[in-house]
Every structure is written in structure tokens, then in C-alpha cells.
């Protein structure tokens, strides 16, 4: 299954992916030569009780959501993501030597309750 | 890195593996033959900025907590299962026939934030 | 100044219920675990209850567990003790404070506000 | 939950004597314990987080020491500002819980 895709004004109160562009210049992030920004996206949402197969969940979360529903003191499953990417980056090290490598887990290609 | 590991008593604030025993038969899943419960552990706790080496996360994860010290309109990271493991089921399907099979996802073996 | 104000007390009757509301100013509440601890007439100081910084986990004493709820609201950068089936033996001054979180470990109050008396008597 | 419990309740100290507060916990609460000062209408005050690390603002005269199950407070030189309500609380493990206090008072 491949989770919800929502966009920045969407109503939905389930767990979706959301558009998010990340912009290294504006943190300060001055040892990354390449790309200057990109595009990251990131999790949102309830996982609420019963988890429902679109929300793309894992079985531990499945029994979780379950226990949640009875003993609030145990959280419920989280949104996060399921799938992600990387990125190939151009950036300077801790040695002052400039790097190309692909850097992984950098974008959320899915979201889900896990 | 391996996160952290809390009882049930631990006043720690961050990400944290707690102990989670799951009883079958208290929920009414009568079709799983065996085991009647198992140890399903779960993940609880903040995921605060900085994001720490130990708190076993993804690259998106510490670039989403910067975007989020900055605009809280972006959540925090999650604190999630990053490993997890099966465990063997004895249960009816949904043709009454007994199933013998590894169940993946069923417990978690180690958090962090995601 | 770093302050916290907290409001909301008063005289109940057993098994009545109260909210208690806790104001923070000059500092972020948000960004801090909070907790409410109570001092009986004369007596010791008792931890009450425990919210984290996302408000997600909230910690309780056995003796208030499943009759007071800790929330916060963080656009209005409040805190709030809703106390239900109140007993004489919860009368008590009710402070709010603010945790350091010493070691990322909940329990270390730095911010104390002034208390708001609660009352349980017939 | 683990009882903390404080000897002696009551203090008699003169002024610029040392005094020293005992804090016991039932079982170990590693370094996770601290000093709160209490004057009489006044709210708790943090004196010392970690066992033995000062708060913002706090005299050099107040000294924590101690981990485990066994931990002191000491005041090296009493001034009359001193004397007040002192209470130890752990922070090692649900529920929070405080000592019954020792109260210092001028002698």
C-alpha cells in the first residue's frame, strides 16, 4: 500500500505525506555547496483506532493502536515515514575537502503508522 | 547506534524501547492459537532538538526537527520502532484452516526517531 | 521576568471538581515539561503530575491517577489541572513548575509559581 | 515507589555554624536527586539538581554530595537567610517523590 499524499490546505486528519522544501541557506547550512534546497516532505496524522490498510501500517502498530484503545497510557502508533530516498549532495567536510556522495534518508517518499 | 532502553518506572524524557507484553485472549483474538501473549515492546517519548546521535535517527529526521525549531507548524520527528522483528503464530485463517507462519513487524526491537 | 501565575482554586465539595490554569510569561511554556506539585496545610511537598513538552505523554500519582488530567494548551501558553471527584484529602496549595529536565530526565523544578489554594470540604 | 526520608526533622544551628541534612532514599536513585529550600510562605526554591550541581544563582555556601541511597546537604556557613524548610525529592523514577523535610532553625 502506498499511504495518503496530501497537500499543504488539505482537511485530511488521517496520516499523509505533506510537501515540505527544506532551504539549507536559510538554516546557516553554508558546508553545502549542492543542492541548495530540496525537496524533503514529511509526515502528518492520526492513526487512529482501527488503523485501516490505506494508512499503510505495520502489525506491531496494528496492535498497538489496540492496546492504545484500552490503556491510553500506551501511545498510539505515530505517523512517520515508510519509505524514504536519498539525495546526492555536494558539500564540504570536516576537513575542508568538498564531497559528492548520495546522502540517504533525506526524503519521504511514503508515510505511515508505525 | 542502538537508542535507548527504559522500564516502565524511567523518568527519561527522550525516545526510549519500553517493555510491552500483549495479551491475545484479553482482546478477544481468539483465532491465534499460540503464543497467547508475547513481548511487543513500544516506542515513547520526545525526539527534542538538537536531535542526539543516540536517539538513533534518520537524516530527514534531524533536518524536519530544524524546520520545526523554526516553524512549529512542521512536527517534531516521531519516536518510532527502526527495528523490529517477526514472531512465530499458530492461527485459523479465514477458511478456518491452522496456520503455521512468521509474522513480521510483531516487536520492536529498537527506537529512534523518525 | 520569568513567571508563572497560577488560578482556578477555591472551596468544592467532595466529589465535586475543579480546573486549575497555570499562565507562563517570559518564557516559552512550550518548550518545557511541565508539572504540578501540591503542599497540604502545614504539611510536605507531593508531586502530582507530569505533561511533556509535546504534550503527548502525561505522567500521574497514584493517589490522582484517573481523577485529575494534566493538558496544555500551547497557543495560549497555558497549562491545566482538571481535578474530578475531588476528596478532602486533595486540599492542598497547588503550585505549577517548570522542569529543567536535569539529564533529559523529568523531576527537576527551577520555576515555581505562587499556588492556588484548593479546598475540599462539606 | 521509593520513600525518601530525611534526617534530622528538625535542625538547631547557630548562625555561621555548618550545617549538614541527610536525605535517604529505599532504593538507589543514582545521581537524580534534588535540594529544594522552602522559607515560610515563600515558594520552593531549587538549591542543587544532580546531586551535587548548584543551581543559577545559588551560594557557593550549599554543597550536594552523595548517590545511591545516601546524600547530604551542606550549608558551610548558616546566614540568617538560611533558615528554612529544606526537602530532598528523587527524580529517578515514577512516581516523583519527596522527602518529609528538615526544617533549620536558628539556635
Known amino acids: 500500500d502506498f499511504g495518503l499524499d496530501c497537500d499543504e490546505h488539505s482537511t485530511e486528519s488521517r496520516c499523509c505525506r505533506y510537501p515540505l522544501t527544506v532551504d539549507f541557506e536559510a538554516f546557516g547550512w553554508d558546508w553545502i555547496i549542492a543542492p541548495k534546497r530540496y525537496k524533503a516532505n514529511y509526515c502528518s496524522g492520526e492513526c487512529p483506532f482501527p488503523l485501516a490498510d490505506h494508512l499503510n501500517s505495520t502489525n506491531h502498530a496494528i496492535v498497538q493502536t489496540l492496546v492504545n484503545s484500552v490503556n491510553s497510557k500506551i501511545p498510539k502508533a505515530c505517523c512517520t515515514p515508510t519509505k524514504m530516498s536519498p539525495i546526492n549532495m555536494l558539500y564540504f567536510n570536516g576537513k575542508e575537502q568538498i564531497i559528492y556522495g548520495k546522502i540517504p534518508a533525506m526524503v519521504v517518499d511514503r508515510c505511515g503508522c508505525s | 547506534d542502538f537508542g535507548l532502553d527504559c522500564d516502565e518506572h524511567s523518568t527519561e524524557s527522550r525516545c526510549c524501547r519500553y517493555p510491552l507484553t500483549v495479551d491475545f485472549e484479553a482482546f478477544g483474538w481468539d483465532w491465534i492459537i499460540a503464543p497467547k501473549r508475547y513481548k511487543a515492546n513500544y516506542c515513547s517519548g520526545e525526539c527534542p532538538f538538537p536531535l542526539a546521535d543516540h536517539l538513533n535517527s534518520t537524516n530527514h529526521a534531524i533536518v524536519q526537527t530544524l524546520v520545526n525549531s523554526v516553524n512549529s507548524k512542521i512536527p517534531k520527528a516521531c519516536c518510532t520502532p527502526t527495528k523490529m522483528s517477526p514472531i512465530n503464530m499458530l492461527y485459523f485463517n479465514g477458511k478456518e484452516q491452522i496456520i503455521y507462519g512468521k509474522i513480521p513487524a510483531m516487536v520492536v526491537d529498537r527506537c529512534g526517531c523518525s | 521576568e520569568v513567571q508563572l501565575l497560577e488560578s482556578g482554586g477555591g472551596l468544592v465539595q467532595p466529589g465535586g471538581s475543579l480546573r486549575l490554569s497555570c499562565a507562563a510569561s517570559g518564557f516559552t511554556s512550550i518548550t518545557y515539561a511541565m508539572s504540578w506539585v501540591r503542599q497540604a496545610p502545614g504539611k510536605g511537598l507531593e508531586w502530582v503530575s507530569a505533561?511533556?513538552?509535546?504534550?503527548?505523554?502525561?505522567y500521574y500519582a497514584d493517589s490522582v491517577k484517573g481523577r485529575f488530567t494534566i493538558s496544555r494548551d500551547k497557543s495560549k501558553n497555558m497549562l491545566y489541572l482538571q481535578m474530578n471527584s475531588l476528596r478532602a484529602e486533595d486540599t492542598a496549595v497547588y503550585y505549577c513548575?517548570?522542569?529543567?529536565?536535569?539529564?533529559?530526565?523529568?523531576?527537576?523544578?527551577?520555576?515555581w509559581g505562587q499556588g492556588t489554594m484548593v479546598t475540599v470540604s462539606s | 515507589e521509593i520513600v525518601m526520608t530525611q534526617s534530622p526533622a528538625t535542625l538547631s544551628v547557630s548562625p555561621g555554624e555548618r550545617a549538614t541534612l541527610s536525605c535517604r532514599a529505599s532504593q538507589s536513585v543514582d545521581s537524580n536527586l534534588v535540594w529544594y529550600q522552602q522559607k515560610p510562605g515563600q515558594v520552593p526554591r531549587l538549591l542543587i539538581y544532580?546531586?551535587?550541581t548548584r543551581a543559577t544563582g545559588i551560594p557557593a555556601r550549599f554543597s550536594g554530595s552523595g548517590s545511591g541511597t545516601e546524600f547530604t546537604l551542606t550549608i558551610s556557613s548558616l546566614q540568617s537567610e538560611d533558615f528554612a524548610v529544606y526537602y530532598c525529592?528523587?527524580?529517578?523514577?515514577?512516581?516523583?517523590?519527596f522527602g518529609g523535610g528538615t526544617k533549620v532553625e536558628i539556635k
Open positions: 525529592q528523587q527524580y529517578n523514577k515514577w512516581p516523583l517523590t
Open positions: 513548575a517548570k522542569d529543567l529536565l536535569h539529564n533529559w530526565k523529568y523531576g527537576t523544578f527551577d520555576i
Open positions: 544532580g546531586a551535587s
Open positions: 505533561i511533556s513538552v509535546s504534550g503527548t505523554n502525561t
